[in-house]
Each structure stands twice: as structure tokens, then as C-alpha cells.
């Protein structure tokens, strides 16, 4: 019988008492085969973290800073359940740390040196740890003691709870630095008052502070937020302009064998029976013998943290950077304006080899990081392990939802000013063999399908979006008799046609021979009835243009396109017979890397782009013998985006809407995780 006990860790007598009450009340409402609670008492949260790591306990609820400690080796814990605040309809699991300024003050984030600062309190998250952690490498050396470095960075501050004797500048704006509400500039409202009164130039608070202190929109409009990219935004645009997004209070468990499903089952049932306004005799979110025992008193309920989300992703790049800077205190030698090498994310070993060759030829401007799937690459870019990669539009959507931004677009047509003119897009098509003359768009049910990969534009999002509108369900593996759609569940009929061996079968990378445009076309040639690809795929792999044995004798005339009106047309008539226009592939990165990725990639394409004529002896960035490694092989240049610099603007309203509609069919664990952070 599986052990269905969750050992909860308590850090005080009062917590242990509440835990025992929690245990007893759960016993009274849950059947004997359901989850149960046991209580383990430890002296501190750090002791609880160690106990969970050592399998002496299973769960504890932690503030963000401790979630970071819990994640570090050797603890390796992960977030599994989040407390939420506000309403069930609009649950808030995160708050945003922001830098508020007066509208007419005219400076940016990178011009804070010499300004006057207002903090909620020394050592507090939004008011100190996050802003000072992010500014850490700009502080004057020596950076220890930290208070002295901060005092020398700003021209004056109010940092309640600081030592006014040793660091008088930190108390300059609030004599005495009192550590309670007796100090008018203490806490969130106090720090905002410090700015409002004109004592300080910037207040480090949370996003709700300004709304709680200024009910009137006209008053709020006198203030702005400083963004990390050295721009400003209105105070209600905090989701796009903050220092960090911080989880409020989170249950953590072991990463391996951590009982996360059991913990969720327990807490979900607990909130049903003992949540807000549920029971008089025991209340989960109430602490008669103290404050915030086991859970925050202000919590309204629990939400399950998506399984794909590790602590780094949950805490977010900015928060992790800030806390790591404060804890480790390491900065690059003298910070310069020069760009660091761009860490390119390569999928599996074929891309890695091409990336390595690029790295060697770039003489250190490009470094390479490997991942097995596109989603793993996106996650690595999010957390700073990698910086950039080029993505199909479907993944630009996921990357955008995860906070990444497009920087340059692949262009596929030769033109005089290629780099200045991003193209409208390419065509997504459905290709069939000419010999299968009875096959049309209207009778694809039961046929064998070939897709570039799940989540990609021409191979999945567009055809499956159109199909969904027709069949009104997501069971595409039942619609087609079998197929190859790399990235599908291994036991799905949409992996049946794939050719990868062993663990590589149906993997969404080049280890699966039917992956990508060329792979999907090969699948049609060898096994399938229809392939969903781009309009250039057939000409690029016929007429001897692809020397591989399977392709070298193919003739374009032996293939036709399916049109949405039920007719068929020759391959060259794609402009009048396609499924939709698809946005070109684009390079994505984190916002903080945008300028450097743009600069280095433009240098690199001038050295190794389409202007290189002999690829047999020279490195060519946009060539890989039809394998589309790192970039599509038909890329002519990487073009500036001009004002299309967000994923929504880049992909266009129509495509974003189409992918949004298909979201209910999404199997993307990363998309689920990212929409948890930003619904």
C-alpha cells in the first residue's frame, strides 16, 4: 500500500500545535485511503529544508528568499503548491517589485547613482534585496559592507532598520531609521510617502503600493515605473515593467520522489473543507495562537504549481539574479560596455556541432549550450543558462509567453536591403503525392500524417488549428490513423510513423529522422499520405537539390498541394493554394540581452552569412545540407524588426489568436508553466 502521509514541517511550538490540529481535522473529513498529515518539528526553516531534502519530512511553506535556499544544492527542492491571495476568479500568487518615480524626474534605471532612495526596510524583499541585488554590480567597490556601498551609491536614503550610527546616509531622509510604523517612512506605504513628500527620488515598493495609497487615477498618473531596459512605463503597466516578479508563499518538496501529487491532493482537499469561510472549528488560513502559522493568514487558497516549473523558473531570472548577486557577491571584472559572448542554444548533437564550428569561427563571440528539445532551450534562455536561438513562430509564441522577446527575423527572399526589410512570412501548405489522386482537404480523416513537430507553425499550429475548427476536439491522434508528429506522447498514434531509433523515436530534434520540414517531407515520401510543411520544402528537396539517398531522385511534379476549398494544385501554385501565411522564424532572447544579441548577430552574419560563396571550405551560418540546423537553410539574412519587437506584434494578431484557440489542445508543459507566472 503506498504511503499517503505528508509529513509537514513546523518551525515553532505554535506551528506544531496548529499542525496537529490540521492533522486531526483532516482525519475527520478524509476517507482512510486518502492523504493524511503527520507533523515534524524543527528549529528553523533551514532545518525544515534540510529535513525535506533528507526525506525526514515532505513539505513546508516558504517565502521567496527561502525558496531560493531550498532550491540550491544539496537541497534541490522545488515549488509544488502556491498560496494565492485576492479572489478565486483572479488569484494572485505573485507580486511585482517595482521602482516608482515622479513623472517629471527624467532619469532611468541606469542613472540611479547619486539619486535619493526610499526603501521599505533593510533586508526586505521589494524594498531592499531585489533593487540592491540588481544594482549590486553598479555599486562602488568595496561592496562589503553592503550598507556602506549603498550609502555611497545614493546621495541619501531612508532604509528603515539600518544602523544610523554606522551608516548615517541610509537614515538621511528619515532620521533614526526607525524599524516600525512610528517611522513615517517605514514599510511599503512609508517608502511611497518618502517619494511623495519629495524626500526621495525613487521608492522601491511592490506594485500594489501605489494603488493602495492613491485611489485617484489622476494622482497615480503623476508617477511612473522605472524598467530594467532603461525606459519608463505608467504605474498600471507593472507586468511589463518591474524589477522582479516574486512568489508570495510557496509549498516546497523534493524534486525527486517528492510526493508532489499527494501534497496537492492533501491541500486541495484541505482548502475544500477548511479554507476561507469553510469551517468554524478549524481554519487553514488563520492563526489564533500567532501569525501566519503554516500558511499566511491573508491567503485565500492554493494553486498547483505546474510540474515543469523548477525553482529557477518559478522565482524568475531577475529575482534569482538579484539574490545570487547579494549572496555570492561576484561581479564581472570591471564592467564594460562591451557585450559578453552570446550563448546560443543548440538542439541535440547535430546542431551542437554546427554551433561549435560557429563558436570557433566567431573567435569567442558565440558560445554553445545544448538542450534536447526546443522547450528546454527556451527554459535555459529564461533562466540565463543560454541567451538566444532562432525559433519557428509557434515557439516564438511560447517564448513570448515566457517573457522572451524577438530580436531579428529570418528573411528568405533576396533583396537589396534584406537586413532592413522583415518579410510578411511564408506559406504553410499540405503536400500529397500526385498518385493519391482522390485525397483532398475534406477527406483527410483516417489518413497518415507527417508533421514538422508539435507546436510548430506550418507543421502543427496552422493545420491542426484549421482541423480543430472542423472537428471541435483535440483528439488529432484519432482523426489520423497514424502519423509522425515529433513531440507527441510516445504511445500516441502520431508517433507510430516516426523513424528515430530507441529513445530518439518521435523526439522533437534532429535525432528523429522525420523531424522538421525536410523530415516531414521524407515521412510523406516513405510512409505518409500528407505532409504539413512550408511552401519551399518540396522544391528544396527535389530535382537533385538534396543529395541524400532518399531524396536524390525525387521530382517536384510528383507532388501536389491540398487547397482549403477541396481542390488540388501544382506545388508552384502555393500562393493560391495554402493553409495560411506563417510568420518567419525569429531569433529570441531575454530583454536584458536584446541589444547585445542584435549587435553580435549582425556582425556574425556579415562575416558568415549569404555573402560567403564557398561553403565547402568556409563556415556558413545559414547552410547545413537541408537540415535547418540553428537557422533555416534558406535564410538569406537576419532582418531588423523595427517596431515589431514583442511576440504579439511580431506574430500578428491573427496568428496569436489562432494559437490561442489551439491552447486548449496544448501539451506544452512549458507554456503551462509560463502562463502560471503570467496568466
Amino acid at each position: 500500500v503506498p504511503d499517503k502521509t505528508v509529513r509537514w514541517c513546523a518551525v515553532s511550538e505554535h506551528e506544531a500545535t496548529k499542525c496537529q490540529s490540521f492533522r486531526d481535522h483532516m482525519k475527520s473529513v478524509i476517507p482512510s485511503d486518502g492523504p493524511s498529515v503527520a507533523c515534524v518539528k524543527k528549529a528553523s526553516y533551514l532545518d525544515c529544508i534540510r529535513a525535506i531534502a533528507a526525506n525526514e519530512a515532505d513539505a513546508v511553506t516558504l517565502d521567496a528568499g527561502l525558496v531560493y535556499d531550498a532550491y540550491l544544492a544539496p537541497n534541490n527542492l522545488k515549488p509544488v503548491v502556491a498560496e494565492f491571495y485576492g479572489s478565486k476568479e483572479d488569484p494572485q500568487t505573485f507580486y511585482y517589485a517595482v521602482a516608482v518615480v515622479k513623472k517629471d524626474s527624467g532619469f532611468q534605471m541606469n542613472q540611479l547613482r547619486g539619486k535619493k532612495s526610499c526603501h521599505t526596510g533593510l533586508g526586505r524583499s521589494a524594498g531592499w534585496n531585489i533593487p540592491i541585488g540588481l544594482l549590486y554590480c553598479d555599486l562602488p567597490e568595496p561592496r562589503k559592507p553592503l550598507e556602506k556601498a549603498v550609502a555611497n551609491f545614493f546621495s541619501g536614503s531612508c532604509a528603515p532598520c539600518a544602523d544610523g550610527t554606522d551608516f548615517p546616509q541610509l537614515c538621511q531622509l528619515c532620521p533614526g531609521c526607525g524599524c516600525s510604523t512610528l517611522n513615517q517612512y517605514f514599510g511599503y506605504s512609508g517608502a511611497f510617502k518618502c517619494l511623495k513628500d519629495g524626500a526621495g527620488d525613487v521608492a522601491f515598493v511592490k506594485h500594489s503600493t501605489i494603488f493602495e495609497n492613491l485611489a485617484n487615477k489622476a494622482d497615480r498618473d503623476q508617477y511612473e515605473l522605472l524598467c530594467l531596459d532603461n525606459t519608463r512605463k505608467p504605474v498600471d503597466e507593472y507586468k511589463d515593467c518591474h524589477l522582479a516578479q516574486v512568489p508570495s508563499h510557496t509549498v516546497v518538496a523534493r524534486s525527486m520522489g517528492g510526493k508532489e501529487d499527494l501534497i496537492w491532493e492533501l491541500l486541495n482537499q484541505a482548502q475544500e473543507h477548511f479554507g476561507k469561510d469553510k469551517s468554524k472549528e478549524f481554519q487553514l488560513f488563520s492563526s489564533p495562537h500567532g501569525k501566519d502559522l503554516l500558511f499566511k493568514d491573508s491567503a485565500h487558497g492554493f494553486l498547483k504549481v505546474p510540474p515543469r516549473m523548477d525553482a529557477k523558473m518559478y522565482l524568475g531570472y531577475e529575482y534569482v539574479t538579484a539574490i545570487r548577486n547579494l549572496r555570492e557577491g561576484t561581479c564581472p571584472e570591471a564592467p564594460t560596455d562591451e557585450c559578453k559572448p552570446v550563448k546560443w542554444c543548440a538542439l541535440s548533437h547535430h546542431e551542437r556541432l554546427k554551433c561549435d564550428e560557429w563558436s570557433v569561427n566567431s573567435v569567442g563571440k558565440i558560445e554553445c549550450v545544448s538542450a534536447e528539445t526546443t522547450e528546454d532551450c527556451i527554459a535555459k534562455i529564461m533562466n540565463g543558462e543560454a541567451d538566444a536561438m532562432s525559433l519557428d513562430g509557434g515557439f516564438v509564441y511560447i517564448a513570448g509567453k515566457c517573457g522572451l522577446v524577438p530580436v531579428l527575423a529570418e528573411n528568405y527572399n533576396k533583396s537589396d536591403n534584406c537586413e532592413d526589410t522583415p518579410e510578411a512570412g511564408y506559406f504553410a501548405i499540405a503536400v500529397v503525392k500526385k498518385s493519391a489522386s482522390d485525397l483532398t482537404w475534406d477527406n483527410l480523416k483516417g489518413k497518415k500524417s507527417c508533421h514538422t513537430a508539435v507546436g510548430r507553425t506550418a507543421g502543427w499550429n496552422i493545420p491542426m488549428g484549421l482541423l480543430y475548427n472542423k472537428i471541435n476536439h483535440c483528439r488529432f491522434d484519432e482523426f489520423f490513423s497514424e502519423g509522425c508528429a515529433p513531440g507527441s506522447k510516445k504511445d500516441s498514434s502520431l508517433c507510430k510513423l516516426c523513424m528515430g531509433s530507441g529513445l530518439n523515436l518521435c523526439e522533437p530534434n534532429n535525432k528523429e529522422g522525420y523531424y522538421g520540414y525536410t523530415g516531414a517531407f521524407r515521412c510523406l515520401v516513405e510512409k505518409g499520405d500528407v505532409a504539413f510543411v512550408k511552401h519551399q520544402t518540396v522544391p528544396q528537396n527535389t530535382g537533385g537539390k538534396n543529395p541524400d539517398p532518399w531524396a536524390k531522385n525525387l521530382n517536384e511534379k510528383d507532388y501536389e498541394l491540398l487547397c482549403l476549398d477541396g481542390t488540388r494544385k501544382p506545388v508552384e501554385e502555393y500562393a493560391n493554394c495554402h493553409l495560411a501565411r506563417a510568420p518567419n522564424h525569429a531569433v529570441v532572447t531575454r530583454k536584458d540581452k536584446e541589444a547585445c544579441v542584435h549587435k553580435i548577430l549582425r556582425q556574425q552574419q556579415h562575416l558568415f552569412g549569404s555573402n560567403v560563396t564557398d561553403c565547402s571550405g568556409n563556415f556558413c551560418l545559414f547552410r547545413s545540407e537541408t537540415k535547418d540546423l540553428l537557422f533555416r537553410d534558406d535564410t538569406v539574412c537576419l532582418a531588423k524588426l523595427h517596431d515589431r519587437n514583442t511576440y504579439e506584434k511580431y506574430l500578428g494578431e491573427e496568428y496569436v489568436k489562432a494559437v490561442g484557440n489551439l491552447r486548449k489542445c496544448s501539451t506544452s508543459s512549458l507554456l503551462e508553466a509560463c502562463t502560471f507566472r503570467r496568466p
Epitope: 556541432l353 564550428e357 573567435v363 571550405g617 568556409n618 545540407e625
Partner: nanobody
Framework: EVQLVECGGGLVQPGGSLRLSCAAS????????MAWYRQAPGKQRELVAG???????NYRDSVKGRFTISRDNAKNTMYLQMNSLKPEDTAVYYC???????????WGQGTQVTVSS
């Protein structure tokens, strides 16, 4: 197809030196980017150092200042001079000319380097 043969490996004490060489048959050598890779037991193969046709070099951080890559186009040979060797340099070392262009997963036998006291 270009054949690449690595040699020069062996057992050496920490702090010692070795010089690996990679001999290529075929004329592609002088125009290709060349590189040394290594693979330790249970680990992924990793790029150690590379050299372009014009002689520009690039090294992984952990070997910078200790290893030197060079090539002699007249002899169709590439070298890796390894000084101040450490136990973590223990691996099978392979050379590649990238001429197979990433797709035909061909690697030579490699040469074993063991750093141990």
C-alpha cells in the same frame, strides 16, 4: 572522405605535458575549420579547442592558458599541446575537421589521455 587519425595520448602525472597530433588524409584539411573534442566516461563529448583556416584559435575556459592548438597545412596535421595537465583532463581526445558537416556522425578512434598520480 577525409580520414583523421589521432595519436600522442598516454598516462601522465598531474602538472605534466602531452602533445596530441591529428593527421588527415585528403586535401580538405587546409581549408576546413579544425577542432579537438574530448569525452570523459559517462559525459557528453565537449569542444576543447578549435582553429580556423586563417589560424584564429578558440579554447574552452577550463583549458585556456594551458592548451595550445596549432596546424601545419603543409603536413595536413593539427596539434594540441597540453601543459599543466589536471586529473579532470582525463578523457578520450578526438579531432574533427567539420568537413563531414555535422550530419554523418563520423569520429575516429580517438586517443586516450589519463592524468593520474
Amino acid at each position: 572522405e577525409v580520414q583523421l587519425v589521432e595519436c600522442g595520448g598516454g598516462l601522465v602525472q598531474p602538472g605534466g605535458s602531452l602533445r596530441l597530433s591529428c593527421a588527415a588524409s585528403g586535401s580538405i584539411f587546409s581549408i576546413a575549420t579544425m577542432a579537438w573534442y574530448r569525452q570523459a566516461p559517462g559525459k557528453q563529448r565537449e569542444l576543447v579547442a578549435g582553429i580556423t583556416r586563417s589560424g584564429s584559435t578558440n579554447y574552452r575556459d577550463s583549458v585556456k592558458g594551458r592548451f595550445t592548438i596549432s596546424r601545419d597545412n603543409a603536413k595536413n596535421t593539427m596539434y594540441l599541446q597540453m601543459n599543466s595537465l589536471k586529473p579532470e583532463d582525463t578523457a578520450v581526445y578526438y579531432c574533427t575537421d567539420y568537413s563531414s558537416r555535422y550530419y554523418h556522425d563520423y569520429w575516429g578512434q580517438g586517443t586516450q589521455v589519463t592524468v593520474s598520480s
